[in-house]
């Protein structure tokens, strides 16, 4: 004799996050009397999703009008799907009973898989700036995607990088996943305008990957090169000495002139010129009154760049009728605190 069967025709259903899932179920008979209930999962811990008899299920609507006579379609729609809704859904027929309805027959189950887009990748660089030739690490993170399969690539100025490590968590089954990747990048003096890009490709993105970027201008520090030169005599007993500060980044720089070790003037780089590579040049000059000196004068241009230990370059000014140009490097001198914030 034929007995009621509960038919769930779809073994699996794939839905994008935010959309509505339709879970199909039909019964072959109106008997026995009793409600259809939908559950996520099986066994004692199963979660009630819908009960035809009673309860309030705001996210669930029935495909057909269950009050209609002869209705045997118990399909439901679940709105605003999130990855947390993934699982196997069972359509279960209950038989009216006292004190409780009795489970009569279950459908085979429909596995609901949720496709969720990854969040926009967030790229973060090192906390402190680094100088050219150093290797720095960048991290890229993206969250909330499903299924687990995902592709992550790193680029520097359009060139794909190979030195990176990527993890997708968790390792086991989950409603959604996160990706974390760390790339190593070697800095060059030309990297002020460079960008590091993390690119994430996922089935939900339909071939249009998400990108996160980091500007190396936030990471790099290019120390300046110094050149001190003596200009021709501008007037009787006056010599113009210039200090060319070249190819530095960022702009934060303070320059101090010393005459024979004594501070003559301190100034902060302001009207700089920008090079094509994004670094800056700046020039400072000092007008020296030769007649005020009986002996030769040692002029030092001392530069503190971006809070780093000072670098300096000296020039020996001969007190004579016709001063000649000459310059000599000195070892870098630390003129004091790195804690000064002079912009």
């Amino acid at each position: 004799e034929e007995e009621l069967q509960v038919i769930q025709p779809d073994k699996s259903v794939l839905v994008a996050a935010g959309e509505t899932a339709t879970l199909r179920c039909t019964a072959t008979s109106l008997i026995p009397v009793g409600p259809i209930q939908w559950f996520r999962g099986a066994g004692p811990g199963r979660e009630l999703i819908y009960n035809q008899k009673e309860g309030h299920f705001p996210r669930v609507t029935t495909v057909s009008d269950l009050t209609k006579r002869n209705n045997m379609d118990f399909s439901i729609r679940i709105g605003n799907i999130t990855p947390a809704d993934a699982g196997t859904y069972y359509c279960v027929k209950f038989r009216k009973g006292s004190p409780d309805d009795v489970e009569f027959k279950s459908g085979a189950g429909t596995e609901l898989s949720v496709r969720a887009k990854p969040s926009a990748p967030v790229v973060s660089g090192p906390a402190a700036r680094a100088t050219p030739q150093h290797t720095v690490s960048f991290t890229c993170e993206s969250h909330g995607f499903s299924p687990r399969d995902i592709t992550l690539k790193w680029f520097k100025n359009g060139n794909e990088l190979s030195d990176f490590q990527t993890n997708v968590d968790p390792v086991g089954e989950s409603v959604s996943y996160s990706i974390h990747s760390t790339a190593k990048v070697v800095l060059t003096r030309e990297d002020v305008h460079s960008q590091v890009i993390c690119e994430v490709a996922h089935v939900t993105l339909q071939g249009d990957p998400l990108r996160g970027t980091a500007n190396l201008s936030e990471t790099i520090r290019v120390p300046p090169t110094l050149e001190v030169t003596q200009q021709p005599v501008r007037a009787e007993n006056q010599v113009n000495v210039t200090c060319q500060v070249r190819k530095f980044y960022p702009q934060r720089l303070q320059l101090t002139w010393l005459e024979n070790g004594n501070v003559s003037r301190t100034e902060t780089a302001s009207t700089v010129t920008e090079n094509k590579d994004g670094t800056y040049n700046w020039m400072s000059w000092l007008l020296v009154n030769v007649s005020a000196h009986r002996d030769d004068v040692k002029l030092t241009c001392q530069v503190e760049h971006d809070g780093q230990p000072a670098v300096s370059k000296s020039h020996d000014l001969k007190v004579s009728a016709h001063p000649k140009e000459q310059g000599s490097n000195t070892a870098a001198e630390n003129t004091g605190s790195n804690e000064r914030n002079i912009y």
């Epitope: 004799e1 008979s29 109106l30 008997i31 026995p32 009397v33 009793g34 002869n70 009216k96």
Partner: antibody, heavy 113, light 111 residues
Amino acid sequence: VEESGGRLVTPGTPLTLTCTVSGFSLSSHGISWVRQAPGKGLEYIGTIGTGVITYFASWAKGRFTGSKTSTTVDLKITSPTTEDTATYFCARGSAWNDPFDPWGPGTLVTVSS
Amino acid sequence: ALVMTQTPASVSAAVGGTVTTKCQASQSVYGNNDLAWYQHKPGQPPKLLIYLASTLATGVPSRFSGSGSGTQFTLTITGVQSDDAATYYCLGGGDDEADNVFGGGTEVVVK
């Protein structure tokens, strides 16, 4: 749906009433039996579905049995008494969201010695 | 077992008037809505009017309406017509599948 088999019987003589259906499948629908004694109200007897889904009101258990074929449903009054004199109706349905509808015209059973 | 008490036993109404019959269950019906209303005229089979407490059966005029939940239910006929003269029965279902019980009926006389 249409009932048949109603007649005059003596007390204790088993009587089988038949409900013949058309236009729907008995594998999908239950058939319920209701009676009305002369001058009284309607009284639910029971519902016949598949083998495991046949049930009778508590007062009717033991007094009635049910069976079915592909197009007919039988209600047997196992040992009629004069109190079983009534018009017997069969109807498609098993209550709640499957109410009794349509009904047959009824068949009269008279139990008398 | 479920007991359905129907009131009044009889009511008369003029054509165009309103008739109300009530049904009280001794305990909550199954799902709070296992209650149907039937119209029965002499020599005819009963006819389904309302099921699930308030759902109008196919082909039934909209002047018939059902309301209520749990233990208290009402059938209302608004704009009574002469053809509405009949006995009206409620049928309640308890938690046990065989626990289906008719009320005693309300005879409606149309003047």
